[in-house]
């Protein structure tokens, strides 16, 4: 008799999830010599242990601690790039500027990027049919808690000037409810971080407005200033030109506003 299964509002676990995580771990540790000591089978076991047999609306940061411990990684604290609603450009940037890091350039971020997963209470099965949606079902689901945990740790590690790439095409350039707005901003350490520098990425080719004056950016500035961290903002009017200048900063066109 088929067992009754909880129907959640979100998509189910990504197909071939265990194989994908394991393969990504192997690939990452091969490419990054400083992580070659990592045992990927142990990483998968710790990942699995965080959510398997647990109610997918009752996951805690504590559940992920064994995985966090295995995935401990030191990135240069002054080369951190946060992003909000503009992941692709942020990743294109760090692919060229190899000594700067987004969360997804770290082992744990790389393992989970774009994946969904959840289990079921009291069974060792992975649920491939549906997983809880953050809004419609519950916030303490395996995916949300994972990203909250790794994002908090990533922000806590930052120092000097922390950069954040923001999407200037959105109605809320800074969104308090995003991972950046709800987790990372509040976990920057004022004793280590001197400045948060926002890069506002323009969408339209002829958009010459100063989006650093946007009310949501002013709200971000206020939050950051109250935390005793300086705030600065730069418009990136031409993201295509920006990437070209990252690739080739000696180019004469890179002496003008990007």
């Amino acid at each position: 008799v088929p067992r009754w299964r909880q129907q959640w509002s979100g998509p189910g676990t990504t197909k071939r999830f265990p194989e994908t995580v394991l393969a990504r771990c192997v690939k990452y540790t091969e490419i990054h010599p400083e992580m070659r000591h990592v045992d990927c089978q142990s990483v998968w076991d710790a990942f699995k242990g965080a959510f398997i047999s647990k109610h997918p609306c009752n996951i805690t940061e504590e559940d992920y601690q064994p995985l966090m411990k295995l995935g401990t990684q030191t990135v240069p604290c002054n080369k951190i790039l946060l992003w909000s609603r503009i992941k692709d450009l942020a990743h294109q940037f760090t692919q060229v500027q190899r000594d700067m890091f987004t969360l997804e350039d770290t082992l744990l971020g790389y393992l989970a990027d774009d994946l969904t997963w959840c289990g079921e209470f009291n069974t060792s099965k992975i649920n491939y049919q549906s997983c809880p949606d953050w809004r419609k079902d519950c916030s303490n689901n395996p995916v949300s808690v994972f990203w909250k945990t790794v994002s908090r740790r990533f922000a806590e590690a930052a120092c000097d000037v922390v950069h954040v790439m923001l999407n200037g095409s959105r109605s809320k350039i800074f969104d308090k409810n995003s991972t950046f707005g709800s987790v990372e901003v509040h976990n920057l350490q004022p004793e280590k971080v001197q400045t948060l520098e926002a890069w506002v990425i323009h969408g339209g080719r002829e958009d010459s407005r100063d989006l650093c004056q946007d009310p949501t950016i002013k709200e971000l500035e206020s939050i950051i200033s109250k935390r005793n961290i300086q705030f600065s903002c730069k418009n990136i009017y031409r993201p295509d030109k920006f990437l070209q200048c990252v690739k080739n900063p000696e180019d004469s066109s890179c002496t003008s506003e990007i």
Partner: nanobody
Framework: EVQLVESGGGLVQAGESLRLSCAAG???????MGWFRQAPGKEREFVAA????????WYGDSVKGRFTISRDNAKNTVYLQMNNLKPEDTAVYYC??????????????????WGQGTQVTVAS
Amino acid sequence: EVQLVESGGGLVQAGESLRLSCAAGRTFTNLGMGWFRQAPGKEREFVAADTWSGTSTWYGDSVKGRFTISRDNAKNTVYLQMNNLKPEDTAVYYCAARLRGWITTRKPNEYDYWGQGTQVTVAS
């Protein structure tokens, strides 16, 4: 090619102030600027830097709260305001530029262009 020319060094008493200037031979747009210093027999030490916005700044621990880096983009000049100088601040001060102005760094080898240096001597 970015030509950097420092000025403003000299001999001062402990507790006094100095302002160093560094003029660049091209527009500052997108450049990140930094100041380093080197005392006799010691390694070059990070003092202060900014990013391409000109408003993001960070400092070496020994000068934090006493030194301020700033820039005037119209004049293509970066400044280092040094207050409450101490004898241990005595060194040759160098201005440096990064073509990748978005990078935050304290490492001298990540700067592309350097000035010739200006001597600062603080007497006790």
